[in-house]
């Protein structure tokens, strides 16, 4: 029988009536175009729509759009579509909403073609008010809001200027022409690259990379000869061009660029690319593109600087610059990432791995799955998961794989078990321990969203035909019920749920079709009534992660540190409420090798644990360049891995003296930085 | 090997308390829960709660709430179990018992090693 | 609490019969069940887990079936070891709850 449909699974008493009542319909009075949606900060209940409808006419497209606001999680909405003077929004900028929970939110207006700006609507107040503003400059991109403080905003404009608002785009200023890309980094630094001959195409790897930390009043060149650049966690990374060719490398800071070393990574040609994975404050995956149109690269981890990377996993499915990738971090655990390879058949391989890269395996086949067609061998095989490029390849999978951070160990993700992805249609596959195992949850594609930390997971059928069912659980998955939430079915096109997994709220969003007109609607349902009472102590249960032997003593052991977490327990219904916090105790591994990367000089042979020396290095002083300083290494192979708080145990040796000599490794060194003032 | 090893019998007057150890050997003692189940003469099996011994945390039945206390020393791998208030039907054998685990699971599985047992008389 | 009835509460068999001792919870358990052998004076022993599944070190005539309420043990061709007091044990919800007991004599 399909899971859930098992006679243990407890029936939730009198669902139907308590959904019934918690659900509400709205209908949007306007013609189907496209519909955007976003929430307005944390737990505010507050939902902007956006619906644009164009109509091409024979010499202009005309365009219309509406606003609706909700402040009940999408029970009920409001026309508030004269609050932006009946305006037509540029739904390619989307709404731009503030970071955390400033209720700031920037929409960018469609202008007629002689204008000599832009137009944007700004509210601070949840939407509820908003203010016009006529812009100096068309807007080329959708406006940042700097992380720290989100009345300072910036934009490019059509012209390649680099624009600055300081009171929330009430007053721009122009600080910078000429501008390809600009980023907000910490500390309201605007880091961004110019061109000083054509065009920002024409001088690639001719650009400079400057940094203003005062909102243009002061500038400093800190990188030349620049391709392009990134940031991740601490790290500021910029590919250079090599002086004598076409190829470049990756240089990394971790002072704002005031310093750079140069990656310890291989160099990349004309139609290769790099490309930042993941980042945090502690280290970074980085894909290196294959030399040919192969559509695979290697991914390499770094250390502690960013500066001595491991290689971690070849063959990694990434198919051009800004392209598709499988490369998925599971947040729902410490140190797991799933990501896809390309195996010399051509087939395409899910792996996963939970140290953070350091060991990458297949994932374990669901125990209540058989092989499929792809398998050699029929009774062993392994699950795997669609993701990015699946969807790309226009499969039948409507959702990339999901976890969230407070609903620990769970993740959701479409899959098949055989030796590799499967064309055929796929499966709802969903694990509670991070994906060490996995259990098939539903059958055939389906929309899915996690509610209330985990204690609800709710799933839509991937359907052409219209719908009217929804599917949840309260178990994790295990045992399912289905709600009919209206007599007339609608034609699907969304889930939306509050980000953070924290609500108790859906919303089903669709439209009718009848013989003349099709209209926008939505079905919000509040399963609070599902879990009618807060959960108690008895209600959790203790689970130790990254468990694989009970018996071992280092067992659960990750980064040289293991974590018990109280989990809820599948058969309590109860809820976890919107301010539930996890709940986990560390505890501190002793040191082992395999709490070790391999240092500059060293590698790792195949399934040894031993970090041996690099033949070609053999017998040489292990000199590079670092902050634009020679630097004499003296080591027994070893580097802590980022993050691991092992103690005791194994302890190898590591020195690094200063050489005392200068080496600019093909970069801007300190002394030859320039600033200048505005 | 894995084993648990218990104190000795046990004659206490009503009114009084008792505690009973329960030395944990052959395995890791922080990484399983560990129970305690009496068993009064001629009767079945009665579960009183549990202790986790790296956290310390405790869950007790409702029925044991108030007299019993479940504590542990890590630095010995020992577990405790302590009863106050001794009436005569408290009279039974005790046990500690260790959580089986699977995976990362601590609850669920049953109870796959057991103390020898601790007989309690209670009389006056 | 979730009460667990299991039946009969005695029976006589002979060496080499098959057995068949059954359990079921009040309310449904998933599987989440677990049945133990005690013999006299000793300290009960863990048979079967998570409803079916062999412990190690047991002997295969055990068998453990079931799921939500009604589950059953079944030893296959009883051994002479095997007279004993046998106890289904609930581990689903808090408080751990355990059958009343079935006790298998000699005939």
């Known amino acids: 029988s399909a899971p859930g449909e098992d006679e243990e699974c407890g029936r939730v008493r009198d669902f139907v009536a308590k959904l019934a009542n918690n659900t509400h319909q709205h209908v949007f009075d306007d013609l189907r175009g496209s519909v955007s949606l976003s929430w307005v900060g944390d737990s505010t209940g507050v939902i902007l729509v956006l619906t644009t409808f164009h109509v091409p006419l024979v010499i202009m497209t005309f365009g219309q759009s509406k606003l609706y606001r909700s402040e009940d999680y999408g029970k009920n909405f409001k026309d508030i579509t004269d609050l932006i003077n009946n305006t037509f929004i540029r739904t390619e900028f989307g709404m731009a909403i503030g970071p955390e929970n400033s209720g700031k939110v920037v929409l960018t207006a469609e202008v007629s073609g002689g204008s000599r700006g832009g137009r944007i609507f700004r509210s601070s107040d949840f939407a509820k008010n908003f203010v016009q503003t006529d812009l100096p400059f068309h807007p080329l991109t959708q406006m940042m809001y700097s992380p720290q403080n989100s009345d300072y905003l910036l934009a490019l404009s059509t012209e390649n200027g680099l624009w600055v608002s300081k009171n929330f785009g009430g007053k721009w200023e122009e600080i910078h022409k000429a501008v390809c890309l600009a980023k907000w980094g910490s500390d309201n630094t605007i880091f961004f690259t110019t061109y000083a001959n054509g065009s920002c195409k024409a001088d690639l790897g001719a650009l400079e990379l400057w940094r203003t930390s005062d909102l243009g009043k002061s500038f400093k060149t800190i990188g030349v000869k620049i391709y392009s650049f990134g940031l991740g966690g601490r790290f500021l990374f910029a590919s250079v061009m090599a002086d004598k060719d076409t190829t470049r490398r990756i240089h990394v800071s971790t002072d704002q660029g005031d310093t750079w070393s140069m990656a310890q990574l291989p160099s990349v040609g004309q139609e290769q690319f790099y490309s930042i994975l993941a980042a945090n404050d502690d280290m970074v995956f980085m894909h290196v593109d294959e030399p040919g149109d192969t559509g695979f690269g290697t991914i390499f981890t770094s250390d502690d600087r960013g500066i001595v990377y491991s290689k971690s996993l070849d063959r990694h499915l990434y198919t051009t610059t800004g392209g598709e990738t499988d490369f998925t971090n599971v947040t729902s655990l410490r140190g797991v990432y799933i990501t896809s390879v390309l195996s010399e058949d051509n087939s395409i391989q899910t792996m996963i791995t939970f140290d953070q890269g350091g060991r990458w395996t297949h994932l374990r086949k669901p125990e209540n799955s058989e092989c499929d067609a792809t398998a050699k061998n029929k009774n062993e095989c392994s699950l795997h998961i669609h993701a990015s490029y699946s969807i790309s390849q226009k499969l039948n999978v409507p959702m990339a794989p999901l976890s969230e951070p407070n609903a620990v160990g769970i993740v959701i993700a479409h899959g098949s078990v055989g030796d590799a992805i499967s064309v055929m249609v796929p499966d709802v596959y969903i694990s509670d321990d991070g994906g060490y195992s996995w259990t098939k949850m539903l059958e055939g594609p389906h929309y899915y969203t996690i509610l209330d930390s985990g204690g609800i997971i709710v799933a839509i059928e991937h359907s052409s035909r219209p719908i009217n069912v929804i599917k949840f659980s309260t178990d994790e998955g295990q045992c399912w019920q289905t709600y009919t939430f209206t007599r007339d079915p609608i034609y699907f096109t969304g889930l939306a749920s509050e980000p953070g997994a924290r609500s108790m709220n859906i919303s089903i969003w669709g439209f009718t079709e009848s013989f003349l007109t099709s209209q926008w609607v939505s079905y919000t349902i509040d399963f609070k009534d599902i879990l009618e009472r807060n959960c108690e102590e008895k209600d959790y249960t203790i689970w130790l992660a990254h468990s694989t032997d009970p018996e071992d003593y280092e067992d659960g052991c990750i980064l040289g540190y293991k974590e018990q977490f109280l989990r809820l327990r599948k058969s309590s219904v109860c809820q976890n409420g919107r301010d539930y916090v996890v709940t986990k105790q560390p505890s501190i591994c002793l040191c082992s090798l395999e709490d070790f990367l391999c240092d500059f000089g060293y590698y790792r042979p195949e399934n040894d644990s031993k970090c041996v020396e690099q033949p070609e290095l053999k017998g040489h002083d292990l000199e590079f360049c670092l902050y634009g300083r020679e630097e004499h290494l003296t080591t027994n192979g070893y580097r802590k891995i980022p993050g691991d708080k092992c103690q005791g145990g194994v302890n190898p040796v590591r020195e690094v003296k200063d050489l005392k000599k200068k080496c600019t490794s093909n970069f801007l060194s300190p002394e030859k930085q320039n600033s200048k003032s505005n | 090997q894995v084993q648990l090893v218990q104190s000795g019998a046990e004659v206490k007057k009503p009114g009084a308390s008792v505690k009973v150890s329960c030395k944990a050997s052959g395995y890791t003692f922080l990484a399983y829960y560990m129970h305690w189940v009496r068993q009064a003469p001629g009767q079945g099996l009665e579960w009183m709660g549990w202790i986790n011994p790296s956290w310390g945390s405790t869950s007790y039945a409702q029925k044991f709430q108030g007299r019993v206390t479940m504590t542990r020393d890590t630095s010995i791998s020992t577990a405790y179990m302590e009863l106050s208030r001794l009436r005569s039907d408290d009279t039974a054998v005790y046990y500690c018992?260790?959580?089986?685990?699977?995976?990362?699971?601590?609850?669920?599985?049953?109870?796959?090693?057991w103390g020898q047992g601790t007989t309690v008389t209670v009389s006056s | 609490d979730i009460q667990m009835t299991q039946s009969p509460s005695s029976l006589s068999a002979s060496v080499g019969d098959r057995v068949t001792i059954t359990c079921r919870a009040s309310?449904?358990?998933?599987?989440?069940l677990n049945w133990y052998q005690q013999k006299p004076g000793k300290a009960p022993k863990l048979l079967i887990y998570a409803a079916s599944s062999l412990q190690s070190g047991v002997p295969s005539r055990f068998s453990g079936s079931g799921s939500g309420t009604d589950f059953t043990l079944t030893i296959s061709s009883l051994q002479p070891e095997d007279f004993a007091t046998y106890y289904c044990?609930?581990?689903?919800?808090?408080?751990?709850?355990f059958g009343g007991g079935t006790k298998v004599e000699i005939k």
């Open positions: 044990q609930q581990s689903d919800v808090s408080p751990i709850t």
């Open positions: 309310q449904s358990i998933s599987s989440y």
């Open positions: 018992a260790r959580g089986k685990r699977s995976s990362g699971w601590y609850e669920g599985y049953g109870m796959d090693v």
